[in-house]
């Protein structure tokens, strides 16, 4: 996140840090106790296999009692994604535990099916443990900035027409940095208590208005996640499952 | 040690097409943005086009918008600049350059390849 | 697009010179500029990045400094192999945008 502030500790208890040999490399956001969202292309050439999925974090290298890590059971990404485009750049990982909520680990509410993006000038925030700067410097924990919707029209001609329809764009608002970077990805826009966009790309450097951030429009995906979600539920199980809704 | 060798260039008539290659080594692609710079005869630099470390994302400058398409294969480390509609001004020698962190400078630069566009 | 524009165009220097060139930009664009040093019929080569760090490798007798629209690249004391063509280059906002150049030449 760049020109952001670190937030309060365990302030966005739905926040998932995905890591790989110890290191973060995305973001994501938790749905269910099983189920966490996170972005397609974290996963183009990594195995999901290999990496852990840490919840109730802040400081991702303290060791932080409320943290609950998980290995991925299952990783499902959505079958339109394309990595030469960024469509459907989306990703269902199911944990391989149930997640115990609490102060520091809640769930995260989807937006409506096929509901309508926020209007342009809506202000949300992004969170993440991405790159606070174009020098890769990590956090010092979990970093926030506010940003606002921009009309998708205005960012298809700044992104020279590569965006689609399920895509969202947000900018700073006036010249200034703002917005998300590298290791941000899968993390999740949040605009009125509900995750409306998920990290997906940004243009040569972090947060230049010139290139907006573009996200995955979630609301064009609820269907096909909980559709996931449903599918995958054993139906002799005993465990009890919650869901945002 | 990083190395970015360039191919591909050569004499094409105006309007032809050509496909200039950026083999990489020493570095992969998915960590790193790939650039083309292009310089023409005794003329200063020009910055072409980018593509993103997951090759899910390009720019281009507004001279090559919609005639030059950059691309990449992670899988042989290689990017691409397919050049098509090719003008006398294209005439210049073409550079592929590695990002220096988020594209804060380009640290490593190709030998260069030369495109003559000329009937 | 940002217009980045190098002063002098072109200057001639003894060895052991201290030469400076400057670089304007039409806008702010905080300390991201970039430095690069070609000789004829190579390849450009970075040496200073964001305003004032000196690349890896790079000789200290080069030096980089300012910020919002003003930079200046500085040679302390030139040396027979500096004699070459600089560029500036802005990575503020897309397009990166570089100075037309200023030729170092032995007077």
């Known amino acids: 996140i760049v020109g952001g502030h670190e937030v309060t500790p365990h302030s966005r208890p739905y926040m998932a840090s995905v890591s790989f040999e110890g290191h973060h490399y995305c973001g994501g956001f938790l749905i269910h106790t099983h189920w966490v969202v996170s972005a397609a292309h974290c996963f183009s050439d990594r195995d999901p296999s290999m990496g852990l999925v840490v919840l109730g974090a802040h400081a991702l290298l303290a060791p932080e009692p409320t943290q609950q890590t998980f290995s991925i059971a299952a990783a499902v990404s959505h079958p339109d994604f394309q990595p030469a485009t960024q469509a459907n750049d989306i990703c269902l990982l199911r944990l391989n535990g149930s997640a115990v909520l609490g102060p520091a680990v809640r769930l995260l509410r989807l937006p409506r099916r096929n509901a309508k993006p926020p209007a342009a000038g809506t202000r949300c925030h992004v969170s993440g443990w991405g790159f606070v700067s174009d020098f890769e410097e990590p956090p010092p924990g979990l970093m926030e900035v506010e940003v606002r919707i921009l009309d998708l029209s205005v960012c298809n001609s700044s992104w020279q027409g590569q965006l689609n329809p399920a895509m969202l764009c947000t900018h700073s608002g006036d010249r200034r940095r703002r917005g998300f970077c590298s290791a941000d990805s899968g993390g999740p826009l949040v605009c009125g208590r509900r995750a409306h966009g998920l990290v997906s790309f940004s243009g040569l450097w972090c947060g230049d208005p010139k290139t907006p951030d573009v996200y995955t429009q979630v609301s064009a995906f609820v269907t096909w996640i909980w559709d996931v979600v449903r599918a995958s539920s054993s139906p002799g199980s005993t465990g009890r499952s919650v869901r945002a809704v | 040690e990083v190395q970015l060798v360039e191919s591909g260039g050569g004499l094409v008539q105006p309007g032809g097409s050509l496909r200039l290659s950026c083999a990489a080594s020493?570095?992969?692609?998915?960590?790193?943005?790939i650039h083309w710079v292009r310089q023409a005869p005794g003329k200063g630099l020009e910055w072409v086009a980018w593509?993103?470390?997951?090759?899910?994302?390009?720019y281009y400058a507004d001279s090559v918008k919609g005639r030059f398409t950059i691309s990449a294969d992670t899988s042989k480390n290689t990017a691409y600049l397919q050049m098509n509609s090719l003008r006398a001004e294209d005439t210049a020698v073409y550079y592929c350059?590695?990002?220096?962190?988020?594209?804060?400078?380009?640290?490593?630069w190709g030998q260069g390849t030369l495109v003559t566009v000329s009937s | 697009d940002i217009q980045m524009t190098q002063s002098p165009s072109s200057l001639s220097a003894s060895v052991g010179d201290r030469v400076t060139i400057t670089c304007r930009a039409s806008?702010?664009?905080?300390?991201?500029v970039a430095w690069y040093q070609q000789k004829p019929g190579k390849a450009p080569k970075l040496l200073i990045y964001?305003?004032?760090f000196l690349y890896s490798g790079v000789p200290s007798r080069f030096s980089g400094s300012g910020s919002g629209t003003d930079f200046t690249l500085t040679i302390s004391s030139l040396q027979p192999e500096d004699f070459a063509t600089y560029y500036c280059?802005?990575?503020?906002?897309?397009?990166?945008?570089f100075g037309q150049g200023t030729k170092v030449e032995i007077k």
């Open positions: 020493g570095f992969t692609f998915s960590g790193s943005g």
């Open positions: 350059a590695k990002s220096l962190f988020h594209n804060v400078a380009f640290d490593y």
């Open positions: 806008q702010d664009v905080s300390t991201a």
């Open positions: 593509i993103s470390p997951t090759g899910g994302n390009t």
């Open positions: 964001s305003a004032s």
């Open positions: 280059q802005q990575s503020y906002t897309a397009p990166p945008t």
